[in-house]
């Protein structure tokens, strides 16, 4: 007889998710030399453990906490990068701009990034059929309990001047619900980041509006000063030729406005 | 410590093979084992690493073709060099650790001269 | 491949005095600059990693600084000693097609008086 299995809203683990995790770990170590005292072994045995056997709708921070032990990495504290609803253009910048960070450029980011993953209470099977929606289903599911771990862990890290990258195209440039609006926003510490500095991505060629004006900039500029730190805002009207230009500094057409 | 060996007199157009023996280590753990060259009274110039952890292999561009790069055993590396030319003249060094070569061996003069 | 660019080639000071080479890098490299001292004859020997980190035995007078493109090594209270050949070493990497490359500097000499 068939076990009946419990049916979420959301898609399965992502196949061969074993497997994915422990390769991008062996990866992650050989290009990042300092990061070779990690046993990838003993990290996927820490990932695996943060949610096998367990109900995937009643994850804490606290089942993640042998994974964030063993993860543990410094970046220079004042070259991070947030982002939110833009993270492709942010992995392009830090991948030019090799001194700045965003979360998926550490160890435990990069092993999560784009992955969906969920056991089923008292088996320790991974479920490759559905795993729990954050709307649809509940908020303390395996994947968004991760996020909000190391998110908040990241933010928290963070010192001097704090860039962010928004993108300047959707109806909410800031959204208070996602994870840089609800978790690293308010998970900054005052006493060490001076400002933080939000980037609005352009989406139209001809668009030449100060989208640093826009409602809900002045509200994360609102939230910011509450806490005690300064904002600072800049358009950036043309995404490609910012990458060009972070690429070649040095280029005459550099020195306009981007 | 690291010990090159193999070097030598050869003729344009030969092939040869160094190698690289690590003694008070081994390379079962993942380590970066690098070639580098320097010709007479000229600089550094890097050719080629292998990541013993994985095996992955990676080279300057001017090298790729005509050298290769293995691991041979747990504390052995090669360098296969073909179809040499006068300009590869120059003491071969063995180096290893990360993004860094903490570690150097000797060094090993290969000669190409008719 | 990325070019690092060395200078001067050569600079020449006196005992007690203060030594500065240059490295630039034709890419942003973040961090991962080393310098290397080299004497005649013998092996390069690591002074500096990860752009000022202090390799092992190595004296406090070697101070390495910088970060992204342009990274440089002072070498203060100059000794006689320190008379040999300087090279800075980058390492690059990119995670998408898996590319690692190390590349060398032409070299500084540092001739002491």
């Known amino acids: 007889v068939p076990r009946w299995r419990q049916q979420w809203s959301g898609p399965g683990t992502t196949k061969r998710f074993p497997e994915t995790v422990l390769a991008r770990c062996v990866k992650y170590t050989e290009i990042h030399p300092e990061m070779r005292h990690v046993d990838c072994q003993s990290v996927w045995d820490a990932f695996k453990g943060a949610f096998i056997s367990k109900h995937p709708c009643n994850i804490t921070e606290e089942d993640y906490q042998p994974l964030m032990k063993l993860g543990t990495q410094t970046v220079p504290c004042n070259k991070i990068l947030l982002w939110s609803r833009i993270k492709d253009l942010a992995h392009q910048f830090t991948q030019v701009q090799r001194d700045m960070f965003t979360l998926e450029d550490t160890l435990l980011g990069y092993l999560a990034d784009d992955l969906t993953w969920c056991g089923e209470f008292n088996t320790s099977k991974i479920n490759y059929q559905s795993c729990p929606d954050w709307r649809k289903d509940c908020s303390n599911n395996p994947v968004s309990v991760f996020w909000k771990t190391v998110s908040r862990r990241f933010a928290e890290a963070a010192c001097d001047v704090v860039h962010v990258m928004l993108n300047g195209s959707r109806s909410k440039i800031f959204d208070k619900n996602s994870t840089f609006g609800s978790v690293e926003v308010h998970n900054l510490q005052p006493e060490k980041v001076q400002t933080l500095e939000a980037w609005v991505i352009h989406g139209g060629r001809e668009d030449s509006r100060d989208l640093c004006q826009d409602p809900t900039i002045k509200e994360l500029e609102s939230i910011i000063s509450k806490r005690n730190i300064q904002f600072s805002c800049k358009n950036i009207y043309r995404p490609d030729k910012f990458l060009q230009c972070v690429k070649n500094p040095e280029d005459s057409s550099c020195t306009s406005e981007i | 410590s690291l010990e090159e060996s193999g070097g030598g007199l050869v003729k344009p157009g030969a092939s040869l093979t160094l190698t690289c023996k690590a003694s008070g280590f081994s390379f079962s753990s993942g380590c970066d084992m690098c070639w580098v060259r320097q010709a007479p009274g000229k600089g550094l110039e890097w050719i080629s690493c292998i990541y013993t952890g994985s095996g992955s292999t990676y080279y300057a561009n001017w090298a790729k073709g005509r050298f290769t790069i293995s691991r041979t055993s747990s504390t052995t590396v090669t360098l296969q060099m073909t179809s040499l030319t006068a300009a590869d003249t120059a003491t071969y060094f063995c180096a290893g650790d990360s993004d860094y070569l903490g570690l150097w061996g000797p060094g090993t003069l290969v000669t190409v001269s008719s | 491949d990325i070019v690092m660019t060395q200078t001067p080639s050569s600079v020449e000071a006196a005992v007690g005095g203060t030594v500065t080479i240059k490295c630039q890098a034709s890419?942003?490299?973040?961090?991962?600059l080393a310098w290397y001292q080299q004497k005649p004859g013998q092996p390069p020997k690591v002074l500096i990693y990860?752009?000022?980190t202090l390799a092992s035995g190595v004296p406090s007078r070697f101070k390495g600084s910088g970060s992204g493109t342009h990274f440089t090594l002072t070498i203060s209270d100059l000794e006689s000693a320190d008379a040999a050949t300087y090279y800075c070493?980058?390492?690059?990497?990119?995670?998408?097609?898996?590319?690692?490359?190390?590349?060398f500097g032409g070299g500084t000499e540092v001739v002491v008086k």
């Open positions: 070493q980058s390492y690059y990497y990119t995670t998408d097609d898996n590319y690692r490359s190390w590349a």
């Open positions: 890419q942003n490299i973040g961090n991962y």
């Open positions: 990860r752009a000022s």
